[in-house]
Amino acid sequence: RAPRCRELPAQKWWHTGALYRIGDLQAFQGHGSGNLAGLKGRLDYLSSLKVKGLVLGPLHKNQKDDVAQTDLLQIDPNFGSKEDFDNLLQSAKKKSIRVILDLTPNYRGENLWFSTQVDSVATKVKDALEFWLQAGVDGFQVRDIENLKDASSFLAEWENITKGFSEDRLLIAGTNSSDLQQIVSLLESNKDLLLTSSYLSDSSFTGEHTKSLVTQYLNATGNRWCSWSLSQAGLLTSFLPAQLLRLYQLMLFTLPGTPVFSYGDEIGLKAAALPGQPVEAPVMLWDESSFPDIPGAVSANMTVKGQSEDPGSLLSLFRQLSDQRSKERSLLHGDFHTFSSGPGLFSYIRHWDQNERFLVVLNFGDVGLSAGLQASDLPASASLPTKADLVLSTQPGREEGSPLELERLKLEPHEGLLLRFPYVA
């Protein structure tokens, strides 16, 4: 008789794929012209990335450091009207993209939480949560919570409002902290909170260190759902050496949890790489005309248009990974096991019941290495086969779909491999 299938876990929409942050509407759409109506026209692009949620804003009225002139219920007219926002929500819903609204109050100011008036700001946030939930948003983000006095209790209250409205709504909190103790204490009082932090960016970017960071995090947070990013708001290029960008995309998409990206991560957009741009919000490079100030500053391979036409580009890799992440059971909610491999490598398996299994091997080193996979520390339920099929490599030159002998597996410098193999009873 065939073995019984394992019962599927309850899956919320944010478990099914990546979140995409657009913190600056104008920079995302190009020079100074960005508004909600224009963003509607970019939803097809977001669909092509197969992201599940859009983390948007802040969009509310905020006069720098002035509580009285900060209104979390009013959209800043520079971004459009409430009607434009409603239209965006409707259009996003039709494309199965959820919209999460950033309500960080003093986003134009010095202290994002108006340090002296925390209580009155917290009440405003409470009111805003209810208002925007009724307007149809799918969740909220608040950032810099390390600067919010008594953050845990406020977050618990806000999560109650959010989940009280519907279990299908999400609260994301962001912190600049990379301290695991601090992160765990924030998570403890909120069962369903998604927390973005700088935890992974406090790294020596070696295979061993990354492995220990990931396993420590997963052990400390128990069986709760995680999110993976390198910061609460910034671009990957601001934290990573360029040669590790592809490797990290592969890792973020295949770790157990929700990957969270910022606009531009999919093309390797760099903060302040072009003259005169704001550091934190570089202009999105849609095509070569996106940066008209200096002719020739943008080459095709830096842009969405150029990379869309190149199957070997970072954008193509992102799309492939996002596609796999959103449809494969083992990547959606599979168990996770790391195992020993050569120095400089980080290797792990994702598996779910009798579904196809995935092996990830990441070479963080500057030299080519033998994988040296040692499956002895894997549980019997996750044993390795002798061969696995290549789903993708982060480097060009390997033939997708080809079977690779695991015992003789070698990786190029900074190469990551995603391999698949079937369940065998």
Epitope: D71, L72, L73, D127, A128, L129, E130, Q134, A135
Partner: nanobody, 125 residues
Framework: QVHLVESGGGLVQAGGSLRLSCAAS????????MGWFRQAPGKEREFVGT????????YYTDSVKGRFTISRDNAKNTVYLEMNSLKPEDTAVYFC??????????????????WGQGTQVTVSS
């Protein structure tokens, strides 16, 4: 059961002001979001504005922004609508409403559980 009674309506010239009150009885309204709506003859009921439980937050429809102000006195169980620079197109029956489930009443009238009977406001040119 919450009973809402509006008052303060009347006839006023364009450019003039009125202050409407909405007195609640039966239950304290300090944990309810409160909203004001209006209905002109032959038209749909239209959202005017809303105020949160504590009075910290207010939200208005674009056509009244900067002219109308909603406030509340929870000790008196009363909500107010201050209307300045009135225009003939503000002519309508004005209703107050209570949302018992949310601290922040919303812009759709379906979200409100209790309604007053309304007070007529007529603005002549």
């Amino acid at each position: 059961q919450v009973h809402l009674v509006e008052s303060g309506g009347g006839l006023v010239q364009a450019g003039g002001s009125l202050r409407l009150s909405c007195a609640a009885s039966g239950r304290t309204i300090s944990t309810y979001g409160m909203g004001w709506f209006r209905q002109a003859p032959g038209k749909e009921r239209e959202f005017v504005g809303t105020i949160s439980c504590s009075g910290t937050s207010t939200y208005y429809t674009d056509s009244v922004k900067g002219r109308f102000t909603i406030s509340r006195d929870n000790a008196k169980n009363t909500v107010y609508l201050e209307m300045n620079s009135l225009k003939p197109e503000d002519t309508a029956v004005y209703f107050c409403a209570a949302d018992t489930r949310h601290c922040m009443g919303y812009t759709k009238h379906g979200g409100y559980d209790y309604w007053g009977q309304g007070t007529q406001v007529t603005v002549s040119s």
